[in-house]
């Protein structure tokens, strides 16, 4: 088998106040099965951003067509980004079980926010 | 509430082609991918060919690969399978069904009936 | 291909089991369907191996281990008569695979 990777090729992104942040994330396998999440910071306060087994997320759609059977593309955009979005993102594999365990994280992507442009 | 509600099924000869539509309700149809399962009579389900929420990807059982085409189009929320070169092997009950996250279904039609007969 | 009994039996308030296997846990997630007369529409009881629909009763649970899935009717009631198909989706082959199906009679 093929070792996962998840690959995060941005270590951050700087967006205006009011635009759309992208995030990347590819994997490189599709195994274990289990779930795609984001999460916006680490440890037990990180919050939930993404999670491709549920919905909806209003201000989050993925980049890419996530129903592809052999999709491999878990990039999001977040609409209408405020000063409170700041903060490190991690794009996270799970591992299918009752429940899902977390198999393996990207490195994060750390967004931070313009001020508005007048 | 979630409707899935399949046309077209006929008699007809073999040789002959067929194409069955399905009509859904109650859901954005355009965010998920979608199937075609048959039951032909005294025997169990057979999945047939699946199709991402886009159309731009499809996925077929050996069987059918060549012979169905599966499409869909989003601006009328309708599912479809074209049938060519039928046999008697063909005559079943034809289901569309919604596919999960992970590509199982949750939710059914209630078929149409395919009969290949001369 | 995905092995299921042909048939299972049970009086009203038994617990029963259905098992499927041939599936891998790596790269493969099961689901349970339930038809009540041949050529009727199945009926989703669990999808993603554990999963129960929303307006599917409690009783009905599943789980996945290893090569095997089983689906568990905790307290069965005669309406639970029917077929129970499984299916998996294998992440390898893109491609998904029904079980022959189990006769479940409510005695």
């Known amino acids: 088998e093929e070792e996962l990777q998840i690959i995060q090729p941005d270590k951050s992104v700087s967006v205006a106040a009011g635009e759309s942040a992208i995030l990347h994330c590819t994997i490189t396998s599709l195994f274990p099965v289990g779930p795609i999440q984001w999460f916006r910071g680490a440890g037990p306060a990180r919050v939930l951003i993404y999670n491709q087994r549920q919905g909806p997320f209003p201000r989050v759609t993925t980049v890419s067509e996530t129903t592809k059977r052999e999709n491999m593309d878990f990039s999001i955009s977040i609409s209408n980004i405020t000063p409170a979005d700041a903060g490190t993102y991690y794009c996270i594999k799970f591992r299918k079980g009752s429940p899902d365990t977390e198999f393996k994280s990207g490195a994060g992507t750390e967004l931070s926010v313009r001020a508005k442009p007048s | 509430d979630v409707q899935l509600v399949e046309s077209g099924g006929a008699v007809v000869r073999p040789g002959e082609s067929l194409r069955l539509s399905c009509a859904a309700s109650?859901?954005?149809?355009?965010?998920?991918?979608m199937s075609w399962v048959r039951q032909a009579p005294g025997k169990g389900l057979e999945w047939l060919a699946g199709?991402?929420?886009?159309?731009?990807?499809?996925y077929y059982i050996d069987s059918v690969k060549g012979r169905f085409t599966i499409s869909r189009d989003n601006s009328e929320n309708s599912l479809y399978l074209q049938m060519n070169s039928l046999t008697a092997e063909d005559t079943a009950v034809y289901y569309c069904?919604?596919?999960?996250?992970?590509?199982?279904?949750?939710?059914w039609g209630l078929g149409t009936l395919v009969t290949v007969s001369s | 291909a995905l092995t299921q009994p042909a048939s299972v039996s049970a009086n009203p308030g038994e617990t029963v089991k259905i098992t499927c296997s041939g599936g891998?846990?790596?790269?493969?997630?099961y689901g349970w369907y339930q038809q009540k007369s041949p050529g009727s529409a199945p009926v989703t009881v669990i999808?993603?191996?554990?999963k129960r629909p929303s307006d599917i009763p409690s009783r009905f649970s599943g789980s996945a281990s290893g090569s095997a899935a089983t689906l568990t009717i905790t307290g069965v009631r005669v309406e639970d008569e029917a077929v129970y198909y499984c299916?998996?989706?294998?992440?390898?082959?893109?491609?998904?695979?029904f079980g022959a199906g189990t006769t479940l009679t409510v005695l």
């Open positions: 069904a919604r596919e999960t996250w992970n590509h199982l279904f949750d939710y």
């Open positions: 109650g859901f954005t149809f355009s965010s998920y991918a």
């Open positions: 199709i991402s929420a886009g159309g731009s990807d499809t």
């Open positions: 891998d846990w790596y790269s493969t997630y």
């Open positions: 999808h993603s191996d554990d």
């Open positions: 299916a998996g989706y294998d992440g390898r082959t893109y491609i998904n695979t």
